[in-house]
Amino acid sequence: EEELQMIQPEKLLLVTVGKTATLHCTVTSLLPVGPVLWFRGVGPGRELIYNQKEGHFPRVTTVSDLTKRNNMDFSIRISSITPADVGTYYCVKFRKGSPENVEFKSGPGTEMALGAKPSAPVVLGPAARTTPEHTVSFTCESHGFSPRDITLKWFKNGNELSDFQTNVDPTGQSVAYSIRSTARVVLDPWDVRSQVICEVAHVTLQGDPLRGTANLSEAIRVPPTLEVTQQPMRVGNQVNVTCQVRKFYPQSLQLTWSENGNVCQRETASTLTENKDGTYNWTSWFLVNISDQRDDVVLTCQVKHDGQLAVSKRLALEVTVHQKDQSSDATP
């Protein structure tokens, strides 16, 4: 034989200002006979929220028809929630008594708290680019959420990161809270196409976390490798020299040719290609005139990448006697 139980399934109910809150309460028996009332708080100062029999409660409606025979559902809805509505709500069974009803059993209570969703996380990367194998910091911020409990995770290309520090402010009671997290990420050479994701989970989001992203392409600088080569074949009295600038990022690049230390102003042919990993290759061709007056020609390919110090590669031109003869022949 079971005694009447008062079931309030939710310990915590998060509601949003202006919305309707549903407070659940079911009883397991009709006995003892008597009403079920709703109160906020406990003790002598508790506030009556709903009494089916008497009083006027314009914002409260019942979920079930309380006049229906054998109704055991005493759940209520409170409309137009305001911050003043927060507190713990109890459904309380009274047994009929003379001269007044006697409290028989109370439910365990449901705490109603104002829930506020966190703002979309904003992820900010470093102010300056950094080269691979160095560590960069990313910050993630989200604001305006309540209650304070929140979970933040970092991912790089879907893999969870562990090197981060998170703070939730303020530490004390507040209407709303903010979270700030800083993650340390080691850059890989292939990270041009990588993403870092900051994921925020909060009870108000009903299991659908918010995400903020940042592209590592904004944080990484992949310096180029240079190679200068002389083409074996010549065209008339000209030799073709190639400067290959490989695997650089970002695209910002200045290339200049020098002949024996003198910067050449003339146009050169070039091509830019993008690699699968998001880096670029740049190829520049330089045509050198060969004459018998010129014994030693040193060519320099100088590259200034993304505002960094210039890097260069030199090539001492190899001109055979046969090539010289041919070129003398070609001179009028």
Epitope: E1, E2, E3, L4, T28, S29, L30, L31, P32, V33, T67, R69, N70, R95, K96, G97, S98, P99, N101, V102
Partner: antibody
């Protein structure tokens, strides 16, 4: 129509126990509270307690706690009252009664009563 | 518990006479929770009036009830022979449900 059919008279010895029945018909047994009422010869009516067959929950008059136990069998639409450690004070007619409705506490339907005699 | 006291305990009246009996409660009773029954010798109680003044099904119009708070009454405007019985009031305002001691009506 609603009917409450009670079991026949009982003659039992002091100290013994007795179980009397009340079979309901004409309504959904599990939906209504059933009460038991005692009436000693030439005396008034005393409410013993009530049972809600839907969940087999009971509520007793403090005076009868430990003396009476109310049970119900939904499969047979029957309510029972068991009285223990019987004395001559328990000699009476026992009625089962049903409220008109849960929210209207008047006994609209009554059984014919079971006479219990406790005698050596 | 709410003790209901009925008076008189017994009364003998002639046919056609008007009869009033009272039921006094030790605690206030809601008018919707005060009921009357009629019990004839060897029979089970029969509902007469519920909620102070509402006649139960099949009850003649000569029966009426009134009252509030702690004081209630049952009136038979013109007694007939079949009205000889004991009349009980019952309250449903608070546990335990209680009955009055009864008023026995005898026809002279």
């Amino acid at each position: 129509q609603v009917q409450l059919q009670q079991s026949g008279p009982e003659l039992v010895k002091p100290g013994a126990s007795v179980k009397m029945s009340c079979k309901a018909s004409g309504y959904t047994f599990s939906e209504y509270v059933l009460s038991w009422v005692k009436q000693r010869t030439g005396q008034g009516l005393e409410w013993i307690g009530e049972i809600y067959p839907g969940t087999i929950t009971t509520y007793y008059n403090e005076k009868f706690k430990g003396k009476a136990t109310l049970t119900a069998d939904k499969s047979s639409n029957t309510a029972y009252i068991q009285l223990t450690s019987l004395t001559s004070e328990d000699s009476a007619v026992y009625f089962c009664g049903r409220f008109y409705d849960y929210d209207g506490g008047w006994f609209a339907y009554w059984g014919q009563g079971t006479l219990l005699t406790v005698s050596a | 518990e709410n003790v209901l006291t009925q008076s008189p305990e017994k009364m003998a009246v002639s046919l056609g006479q008007k009869v009033t009996m009272t039921c006094s409660a030790s605690s206030s009773v809601s008018s919707s929770d005060l009921h009357w029954y009629q019990q004839k010798s060897g029979a089970s109680p029969k509902p007469l009036i519920h909620g102070t003044s509402n006649l139960a099904s099949g009850v003649p119009a000569r029966f009426s009830g009134s009252g509030s708070g702690t004081s209630y009454s049952l009136t038979i405007s013109s007694v007939e022979a079949e009205d000889a019985a004991t009349y009980y009031c019952q309250q449903w305002s608070g546990y335990p449900w209680t009955f009055g001691g009864g008023t026995n009506l005898e026809i002279k």
